[in-house]
């Protein structure tokens, strides 16, 4: 049962991480000046990806920001204290 729970948790976070890497891909496109304006669609991620943050992720949505923080917390739990310290130092910048 524990393995199933871990599987569900990992799957959920894999989806979130997929979203974030898609966001990073968009970010690199923006940095290279590729394509037109972002956002405007009616899909699941139709938020404008316009504001830059210390961790290099674009977001204008508070719920997306919370998802990013959840990913950080999850990675800290999985990867341990050293990762958490790195995350903390980055957040303080």
């Amino acid at each position: 049962r524990r393995d199933v729970a871990h599987g569900i948790l990992n799957e959920a976070y894999r989806k979130v991480l997929d979203q974030l890497s898609a966001g990073k891909h968009l970010q690199s496109l923006v940095a290279r000046g590729v394509g037109g304006s972002l956002g405007g669609g009616a899909g699941d991620d139709a938020e404008p990806l316009s504001k830059r943050h210390s961790d290099g992720i674009f977001t204008d949505s508070y719920s997306r920001y919370r998802k990013q923080m959840a990913v950080k917390k999850y990675l800290a739990a999985v990867l341990g204290k050293r990762y958490k310290q790195r995350v903390k130092n980055k957040g303080r910048r």
């Epitope: 938020e47 977001t59 204008d60 949505s61 508070y62 719920s63 957040g91």
Partner: antibody
């Protein structure tokens, strides 16, 4: 019982800085988002920024960018809001508020900061 | 920033009568996660604000059922179905969907 207890009233001169504290209890501090909101006398509410204590990530309102610093001390479950280069328009009650679900479920009692020469 | 426009600025209602406060946002508050982060606060003189309604229509536990929230997208309403003396306060809507988080200007509710 969830509680947010803020530091006492402050009187400051223009150009100075103020640091307000907010001590949290009754919940897991690192699992929350701590926000700061201010209210000038007889005016409405204004969001200043937030901190996620677990990672120390912050997000500030554009209006206060460069002038506000929000920090958190996990060991004491205390959040701090420092506002610099104070001017008379910064006279207000400053509130901390906790968010679990995309909304401010609990608020501190408020800290009056008076800026006067 | 999202502009939150509340109306009216003040409202005088007889005890037992209905009070209706409107809140309009300059952009849809429906988030990608399917929730609408529109909230209603009540603030009495000398006190911090208190959460009444979150997610547009979910009542905070312990809040009397005479308070209800409705609406979607950009148009929202707080209704007090039967005004009581203890409901005299300023009511604020605010949005938690988009940064920067923003508040309406408030509606002062008084007894006629």
């Amino acid at each position: 019982e969830v509680q947010l207890v803020q530091s006492g009233a402050e009187v400051k001169k223009p150009g100075e800085s103020v640091k307000v504290s907010c001590k949290a209890s009754g919940f897991t501090f690192t699992d929350s988002y701590m926000h700061w909101v201010r209210q000038a006398p007889g005016q409405g509410l204004e969001w200043m920024g937030l901190i996620y204590p677990f990672s120390a990530d912050t997000r500030y309102a554009q209006k206060f960018q460069g002038r506000v610093t929000i920090t958190a001390d996990e060991s004491t479950s205390t959040a701090y809001m420092e506002l610099s280069s104070l001017r008379s328009e910064d006279t207000a009650v400053y509130y901390c508020a906790i968010d679990y679900d995309g909304s401010f479920a609990y608020w501190g009692q408020g800290t009056l900061v008076t800026v006067s020469s | 920033d999202i502009v939150m426009t509340q109306s009216p600025d003040s409202l005088a209602v007889s005890l037992g009568e209905r009070a209706t406060i409107n809140c309009k946002s300059s952009q849809s508050l429906l988030d990608a996660d399917g929730k609408t982060y529109l909230n209603w606060l009540q603030q009495k003189p000398g006190q911090p604000p208190k959460r009444l309604i979150y997610w547009a229509s979910t009542r905070e536990s312990g809040v009397p059922d005479r308070f209800s929230g409705s609406g979607s997208g950009t148009d929202f309403t707080l209704t007090i179905s039967s005004l009581q003396a203890e409901d005299v306060a300023v009511y604020y809507c605010w949005q938690g969907t988009w940064f920067d988080l923003t508040f309406g200007g408030g509606t002062k509710v008084e007894i006629k």
